[in-house]
């Protein structure tokens, strides 16, 4: 039940051993009690004991004190449990009976007689405090106390609030006297089922399943889950957001696995060679003469450099070489001659000059011959003097270059410009390319040579009135009307009533100049726009520190690093090129990204919304101006948009809008 009415019998006095009918008990009144508890009645009536009833065994004879007994037969206080909301009022009937029969179950014995009875009616609040009372009549006296208490797990003024203390998966609490939950230390929530995480545990990046714990969501680490984990493939880098790979000093590459100081760290170059931090392996060795190999580890033949002169033959020795000189020469390299001009040592018409008072000589060679004795024929083509694939030809004392089509000059160094003959019509800009000239056409024209006027011409509809001349503007939708004498307005629609003495020539000249000026400004703007839109190929720069670039061709926004203000960002969306976007002449400032890219605002379990920033966040870029249009960079898994602010250095009128 929800509560218990408890009645403690304390003392019964029946000194004369009399029954209610005036007779006396023989040999004495063997007394037991019947208790009936019912709803409040102003006048107690017979009928069912609606709140319960109980009987005692024989507790004594005539007069006796009733001791407390917690178990077994003759339990005191008496318990009357109920399983309803306690109403706060009651009627109680206590009857004392004499039995001649069985002591243990006297209520069933025949011949029982009433000794006395008392009726109590009134109100009684639930509580632990006993209410004590004493009832007398002419023959008997009964001392007793009573109270109403709630059963285990029931609380409140009427024992109507159920609360069972627990410490399990469904809750961790004790019960307050009023039945409300009191969470055990470390737990919170309506049902005390939410643990209080370690103090300082990051609200988004961490969670806990028991008190004082801090479990990190994917990509985060540390006691408070406020430190990121670098990318899986990262080797010598750190992160400021999960899965990033920002290289430590001296390291480069996508996963920071290229040693930018390989020479210092590993000293790979042998035999005194010079090491430079470049090349496919991160280093290059420049060997000293006499050494070769990737690390200059291989010693060349000492004779490989042809040290012997004047026809001397070279012989390798263990650590050096030896020159065997032909007759007439001596010295380590056969560099000294024993001949003189008298021996006619100069060949091919060389003239001999005596040196050192006639003890040696020097030959002065005619063109096309060289060597100390003019014995070698000069090949003027050995230095590959002809550029751009020109063929070198020895022609007597000189050489000539035979140039490929499109090139000229002594060394074929001059490119014959295809643009020299101005092949581009309608003011198109000409670019010399290997396969011929390419024209960049102004607005309103197309074709290889800008010879085709785009049919969607603003002037085609004849927007100018009164015989005005129409000129197409910068874009196909723009036009300018050059008004004839006597008309004004953007379409020359308004006639002007002018006095006879009006200075027509001056006005016509003024209007003409204004129109020319407008057209000139438009052309300048157009040329500038074209130049702005052209990718700046010379200043391409390698993107370092890119992290996980594979996930569905999404750009991990915070991982883009581009310090080149004119860099164009191209996105390859695999086979489906319709998903590709190109950003030109816009700077994506890496340092702005963490602050600008918000967390996904999706409800539900943490990872769905917390794949933040450096992870696989799709970039959606749109522009509000046609000339700033940027194709969406998209993917089948685009489920969450993030905002990126793109700020143009050069075109302030282009405002890039973003979706979140």
């Amino acid at each position: 039940g929800s509560g218990i009415f408890q009645l403690r019998l304390q003392e019964f006095v029946n000194q004369r051993g009399m029954l209610a009918n005036g007779q006396s008990c023989e040999p004495g009144c063997r007394t037991f009690f019947r208790i009936c508890l019912k709803h409040f009645q102003a006048t107690f009536s017979e009928g069912p004991c609606t709140f319960g009833n109980v009987s005692t065994p024989v507790l004594g004879t005539n007069s006796f004190v009733v001791r407390d007994k917690n178990s077994g037969s003759g339990r005191n206080p008496l318990q009357l449990p109920f399983n309803f909301t306690w109403p706060g009022t009651f009627s109680l009937n206590i009857q004392a009976w004499h039995t001649p029969g069985d002591d243990l179950r006297p209520e069933t014995s025949p011949g029982n007689s009433l000794i006395s009875q008392i009726i109590i009616q009134g109100s009684l609040a639930v509580g632990k405090i006993w209410r004590t009372d004493e009832q007398n009549d002419t023959l008997t006296r009964l001392s007793y106390s009573y109270r109403v208490i709630c059963s285990d797990n029931y609380y409140g003024e009427s024992c109507s609030r159920l609360c069972k203390k627990r410490d399990d998966h469904f809750g961790h609490y004790e019960c307050q006297p009023d039945g409300s939950l009191s969470c055990l230390p470390g737990w919170t929530g309506k049902y005390c089922d939410q643990p209080i995480c370690l103090s300082g545990c990051h609200e988004q990046n961490g969670y806990c399943s028991k008190p004082d714990e801090c479990i990190c969501r994917p990509g985060w680490q540390g006691r408070l889950c406020n430190e990121c984990i670098p990318h899986n493939g990262c080797r010598h880098g750190t992160c400021s957001i999960p899965w990033q790979c920002a290289c430590d000093e001296g390291w480069g590459g996508l996963f920071c696995d290229q040693d930018l100081n390989y020479c210092t760290h590993h000293s790979p170059c042998k035999n005194g060679s010079t090491c430079s931090n470049s090349g496919p392996k991160g280093y290059t060795c420049t060997c000293l003469p006499g050494y070769t190999g990737e690390h200059c580890e291989l010693g060349l033949s000492k004779c490989a450099s042809n040290p012997c002169r004047n026809g001397g033959s070279c012989k390798d020795q263990e650590n050096s070489y030896h020159c065997l000189c032909p007759p007439g020469y001596y010295g380590q390299h056969c560099e000294h001659s024993t001949l003189t001009c008298a021996d006619s040592p100069c060949f091919n018409g060389g003239s001999c000059r005596e040196r050192n008072q006639g003890s040696s000589y020097a030959c002065e060679c005619p063109p096309n011959f060289t060597g100390s004795n003019c014995e070698k024929k000069v090949d003027r083509c050995t230095s590959n003097p002809c550029a751009n694939g020109g063929q070198c030809q020895n022609r007597g004392p000189s050489r000539t270059c035979r140039c490929r089509p499109g090139f000229t000059g002594t060394h074929c160094e001059l490119h014959i410009s295809d643009c020299a003959r101005s092949p581009c019509a309608h003011g198109g800009t000409c670019h010399d390319l290997e396969n011929g000239p390419v024209c960049t056409c102004p607005a309103g024209f197309s074709g290889r040579r800008c010879e085709v006027r785009i049919t969607h011409d603003a002037c085609a509809s004849g927007p100018c009135f009164n015989g005005a001349t129409c000129y197409t503007g910068l874009s196909p939708n723009n036009f300018v009307c050059n008004c004839p004498y006597g008309f004004v307005g953007s379409r020359c629609e308004f006639p002007v009533g002018l006095p006879p003495s009006f200075p027509w020539v001056a006005v016509s000249l003024g209007v003409g100049l204004v129109v020319l000026l407008v057209l000139l400004v438009m052309v300048v703007v157009a040329v500038r726009q074209l130049r702005l839109r052209r990718p700046d190929d010379e200043s391409r720069e390698a993107m370092n520190n890119l992290s996980d670039f594979q996930k569905d061709n999404l750009i991990p926004a915070a991982q883009l690093k581009n310090t080149n203000q004119k860099k164009e960002l191209e996105v390859d969306c695999g086979l489906d090129k319709s998903n590709c976007g190109k950003l030109q002449n816009h700077t994506l400032d890496y340092n702005l990204a963490p602050g600008l890219l918000g967390r996904g605002g999706m409800p539900g379990k943490y990872p769905h919304s917390d794949k933040s920033l450096g992870e696989k966040v799709p970039l959606r870029l749109h522009s509000e101006k046609p000339e700033c249009r940027i194709s969406a960079i998209c993917s089948p898994r685009d489920s969450m948009y993030q905002s990126v602010c793109l700020i143009s250095e050069e075109r302030n009128e282009c405002v890039i809008a973003t979706e979140v």
Epitope: S209, I215, C216, R217, P218, G219, W220, Q221, G222, R223, E227, I229, P230, N232, G233, C234, R235, H236, G237, T238, D248, D548, K551, K605, P607, H608, K611, K616
Partner: antibody, heavy 118, light 107 residues
Framework: EVQLVESGGGLVQPGGSLRLSCAAS????????MAWVRQAPGKGLEWVAT????????YYRDSVKGRFTISRDNAKNSLYLQMNSLRAEDTAVYYC???????????WGQGTLVTVSS | DIQMTQSPSSLSASVGDRVTITCRAS??????LAWYQQKPGKAPKLLIF???DLADGVPSRFSGSGSGTDFTLTISSLQPEDFATYYC?????????FGQGTKLEIK
């Protein structure tokens, strides 16, 4: 090239202790969280413990809590697992791995066998 | 703890075959799932992380898909070196847990 080399395994009696070491190279050890993962003979893989790179915070599977201690020495590029009060069910090949409990284990050592038997 | 169940526990296939291994999580783990390959007497090797991202140096014949509770590893054309045991692992919930493994044998 990333390399993780475990050592310290061997035969030990129940209740005994063992200390495993893992020498790391080919990456900046101090930048990355590390873990121990074990595999009982003929069985599957089981995560044992993790230590963060940032502040050395440690986590353990329930069955080894209070008996095993994971630690690291960034100056020596080394990871350790101190195993006390060993039980027969701790018998396994112990792998040192780079990763946390909430990230993939990107690199693994060759493993060291720990046999707990009387 | 999250239970990871792989199926089949073993399978036989021939070189050139297309093979699919599945992994089921007892709770939604989003895309926080990895696949590993282990050859006898060797350490496991990371193949795929975040459900579908290939680890560095892994051939493109390996691919992964799924999200939530159901995931698959596919080998488009089996090569002799692919015969091994494959494990899935979730790292969405603490503690991380592995599947029991799928042994891929030569038919």
């Amino acid at each position: 090239e990333v390399q993780l080399v475990e050592s310290g395994g061997g035969l030990v009696q129940p209740g005994g202790s063992l200390r495993l070491s893992c020498a790391a190279s080919g990456f900046t050890f101090s930048n990355f969280p590390m873990a121990w993962v074990r595999q009982a003979p003929g069985k599957g893989l089981e995560w044992v413990a993790t230590i963060s790179s940032s502040d050395g915070t440690t986590y353990y599977r329930d069955s080894v809590k209070g008996r095993f201690t994971i630690s690291r020495d960034n100056a020596k590029n080394s990871l350790y697992l101190q195993m006390n009060s060993l039980r027969a069910e701790d018998t396994a090949v112990y792998y040192c791995a780079r990763g946390y409990y909430n990230s993939p284990f990107a690199y693994w050592g060759q493993g060291t066998l720990v046999t707990v038997s009387s | 703890d999250i239970q990871m169940t792989q199926s089949p526990s073993s399978l036989s296939a021939s070189v050139g075959d297309r093979v699919t291994i599945t992994c089921r999580a007892s709770q939604d783990i989003y895309i926080n799932l990895a696949w590993y390959q282990q050859k006898p007497g060797k350490a496991p090797k990371l193949l795929i992380f975040d459900t579908s991202d290939l680890a560095d140096g892994v051939p493109s014949r390996f691919s992964g898909s799924g999200s939530g509770t159901d995931f698959t590893l596919t080998i488009s054309s089996l090569q002799p070196e692919d015969f091994a045991t494959y494990y899935c692992q979730q790292y969405d919930y603490y503690p991380p847990t592995f599947g029991q493994g799928t042994k891929l044998e030569i038919k």
